[in-house]
Interface confidence: medium
């Protein structure tokens, strides 16, 4: 047993543009409160019942009235921690939902009005007894900063709160086979209290109240010897005496889920998927009605017609599940075209478009060259959401505004000297070479490797490279 503790540090506008409007006004003062829901395991879809580990509601925060014209500040928060007690072992991995609710305190008929301001959800690994874990979550334009930890309630200790500690009976040492309880060195690990009647010779337990059998024994209290004539053997250690597998207890054996819940094994333990109207680690809690507020994310609770269903949640757009606890991943349909980034803001989908594209789904390919001038006779070339200038000779840079140095690349071969010219470059060739870039040797007999020098140009004259 232990307690999950949640400390809300701040709730206010997140960084960046588009600050949210203050949730309260001079005409409608309001105050905040928070709701946390925890469930075991890492899968948000694993259990229909959203709060199998427990849930808690904060106190109401101080009344807040918006100052007209002022930006929304961090809003005043309720005092104290949100505490969610857990009765069994801490699962180590858990999913959380934290909702920020607004209570409007105007002149509503029939009492204050509640509305959901923001909801954040996540999956985390957390060992009990560790330090506060810090977190920042964003919901639309709001930002929630909080910390959380799981701590064991004495006498439980350990990362799952399954080891028990008791004060030492003798001042100097612990009993046989029992270790000191670090860091409480003056205490000893207590023997676990197994299920009543569990065989002390053939059974053992790793968690209070269970009875796990040693090899060769079976039954709820490990008092029945395993028949060696037929090996059923889906699981469990190999038996040295019979040469076959002995069935060991699996976490779902005997179905620990009550009230028609279905059991599925997890790496550490088991998880129950509860029918509507039941929740808890083993679906043992029943009788949920609309008065318990079982619908998350602004879902509308309606009393169920049939006796098995005490309530029905009508979910707002973007949520599903019997308690509206599951967010519909609307971005999985990839609504944003041309590589746009999909953002599910809860109330709406938004596409953040790549450069060169626009529209609600980034479906419009902008004319990259519209309004883009390339200087000095350059021409604009479109491509991939960006524009590029193809520059005239002698110019370079993004917009052809930079004068290029045509000699920078040393274009004249065989020691020829390069001269920048208004329309390009000129190579003055070393003796024995000719051509636009001095690339052709002049033959010893006076004939060149070129077909013929143009009239009026002698081999060795500067050749202008166009």
């Amino acid at each position: 047993a232990g307690v999950f503790e949640l400390q809300i540090h701040s709730f206010g506008p997140g960084p960046g543009p588009g600050a949210p409007r203050s949730p309260c006004s001079a005409r409608l003062p309001c105050r905040l409160f928070f709701r946390v829901c925890l469930k075991p395991g890492l899968s948000e879809e694993a259990a229909e019942s959203p709060c199998a580990l427990g849930a808690a509601l904060s106190a109401r925060g101080p009344v807040y009235t918006e100052q007209p014209g002022a930006p929304a500040p961090d809003l005043p928060l309720p005092d104290g921690l949100l505490q969610v007690p857990f009765r069994d072992a801490w699962p180590g991995t858990f999913s959380f939902i934290i909702e920020t609710w607004r209570e409007e305190l105007g002149d509503q008929i029939g009492g204050p009005a509640w509305s959901l301001l923001a909801r954040v959800a996540g999956r985390r690994r957390l060992a009990a007894g560790g330090p506060w874990a810090r977190d920042i979550q964003r919901a639309g334009a709001w930002e929630l900063r909080f910390s959380y930890r799981a701590r064991c309630e004495p006498p439980a200790v350990g990362t799952a709160c399954t080891r028990l500690c008791r004060p030492r009976s003798a001042p100097s040492r612990c009993g046989p086979g029992l270790r000191p309880c670090a860091p409480l060195e003056d205490e000893c690990e207590a023997p676990l209290v197994c299920r009543a009647g569990c065989s002390p010779e053939h059974g053992f337990c790793e968690q209070p109240g269970e009875c796990r059998c040693l090899e060769g024994w079976t039954g709820p209290l490990c008092t029945v010897p395993v028949s060696t004539s037929s090996c059923l053997s889906p699981r469990g250690p190999s038996s040295a005496t019979t040469g076959c597998l002995v069935p060991g207890p699996g976490p779902c054996d005997g179905n620990p889920c009550a009230n028609g819940g279905s059991c599925s094994e997890t790496p550490r333990s088991f998880e129950c998927t509860c029918p509507r109207g039941f929740y808890g680690l083993r679906c043992e809690v029943s009788g949920v009605t609309c008065a318990d507020g079982p619908c998350f994310n602004g879902g509308l609770c309606v009393g169920g017609a049939d006796p098995d269903s005490a309530y029905i949640c009508h979910c707002p757009p973007g949520f599903q599940g019997s308690n509206c606890e599951k967010r519909v991943d609307r971005c999985s349909l990839q609504p944003c075209r041309n590589g746009g980034l999909c953002l599910d803001l809860g109330h709406a989908l938004r596409c953040r478009c790549r450069a060169g594209f626009a529209g609600p789904r980034c479906e419009h390919d902008l004319d990259d060259c519209a309004g883009r001038a390339c200087a000095n006779g350059g021409t604009c070339v479109e491509g991939g959401g960006a524009h590029r200038c193809s520059c005239a000779l002698g110019f370079g840079g993004r917009d052809c505004r930079e004068r290029a140095d045509p000699c920078a690349a040393r274009p004249c071969a065989h020691g020829g000297r390069c001269y920048a010219h208004f329309s390009g470059l000129v190579c003055a060739c070393a003796p024995g070479y000719m051509g636009a870039r001095c690339e052709f040797p002049v033959h010893p007999d006076g004939a060149s490797a070129l077909p013929a020098a143009p009239p009026g140009l002698r081999p060795g004259d500067p050749q202008r490279y166009l």
């Epitope: 400390q7 961090d74 060992a127 330090p131 900063r145 910390s147």
Partner: antibody, heavy 121, light 107 residues
Framework: QVQLVQSGAEVKKPGASVKVSCKAS????????MHWVRQAPGQGLEWMGW????????NYAQKFQGRVTMTRDTSISTAYMELSRLTSDDTAVYYC??????????????WGQGTMVTVSS | DIQMTQSPSSLSASVGDRVTITCRAS??????LNWYQQKPGKAPKLLIY???SLQSGVPSRFSGSGSGTDFTLTISSLQPEDFATYYC?????????FGGGTKVEIK
């Protein structure tokens, strides 16, 4: 009582590494983040990073990324900070500091006595 | 990174004086601000956390205020043991950063 005791002063050559230890006592070592902060002679305080002693997770300041390694040994309630490729600019007093018992507000409640690291050729 | 600017960098005061030190953040840090006192050759000591909460064991003459970007540490009546250097530190986001310090000297 709650205290952090650090290893003794070190003199290192440029390019070498230094490993400073910080032994915790009087509290549950795995229950609080451990931070490392340094202070060059006559200068202000500079945060280097933290380690979660429970999980071993770390968070280093970008400036020290690739040069600093923070580790812990829970069996002896000790945190370590190793800084490599030392230069004269790393001459400083290095402190370990424990998070306050407040919900992860990164306030440094308990400090070690400091370890002077001198880098000189 | 969030820059923290403290002012003044040093001040001279007498025993019994009211002393105010300010700290400004380069962006809003809500109330994620802590104050420390450091004496020569010693490790810093936490005085105030979360902008205005007094750390246990710290005399009530120390107080903190502010939110957002502007914060103040006030010593209502300076005592001989208060002559030291004071640092502010933001814990809104990593890297955690400190102000440059304010040295309080005897006039």
């Amino acid at each position: 009582q709650v205290q952090l005791v650090q290893s003794g002063a070190e003199v290192k050559k440029p390019g070498a590494s230094v490993k400073v230890s910080c032994k915790a006592s009087g509290y549950t070592f795995t229950g609080y983040y451990m931070h490392w902060v340094r202070q060059a002679p006559g200068q202000g305080l500079e945060w280097m990073g933290w380690i979660n002693p429970n999980s071993g997770d770390t968070n280093y300041a970008q400036k020290f990324q690739g040069r600093v390694t923070m580790t812990r040994d829970t069996s002896i309630s000790t945190a370590y900070m190793e800084l490599s490729r030392l230069t004269s600019d790393d001459t400083a007093v290095y402190y370990c500091a424990r998070d306050a018992n407040i919900a992860a507000l990164d306030a440094f409640e308990i400090w070690g006595q400091g370890t002077m690291v001198t880098v000189s050729s | 990174d969030i820059q923290m600017t403290q002012s003044p960098s040093s001040l001279s005061a007498s025993v019994g004086d009211r002393v105010t030190i300010t700290c400004r953040a380069s962006q809003s840090i809500s109330s994620y601000l802590n104050w420390y006192q450091q004496k020569p050759g010693k490790a810093p000591k936490l005085l105030i956390y979360a902008a205005s909460s007094l750390q246990s064991g710290v005399p009530s003459r120390f107080s903190g205020s502010g939110s957002g970007t502007d914060f103040t540490l006030t010593i209502s009546s300076l005592q001989p043991e208060d002559f030291a250097t004071y640092y502010c530190q933001q814990s809104y986001s990593t890297p955690l950063t400190f102000g440059g310090g304010t040295k309080v000297e005897i006039k």
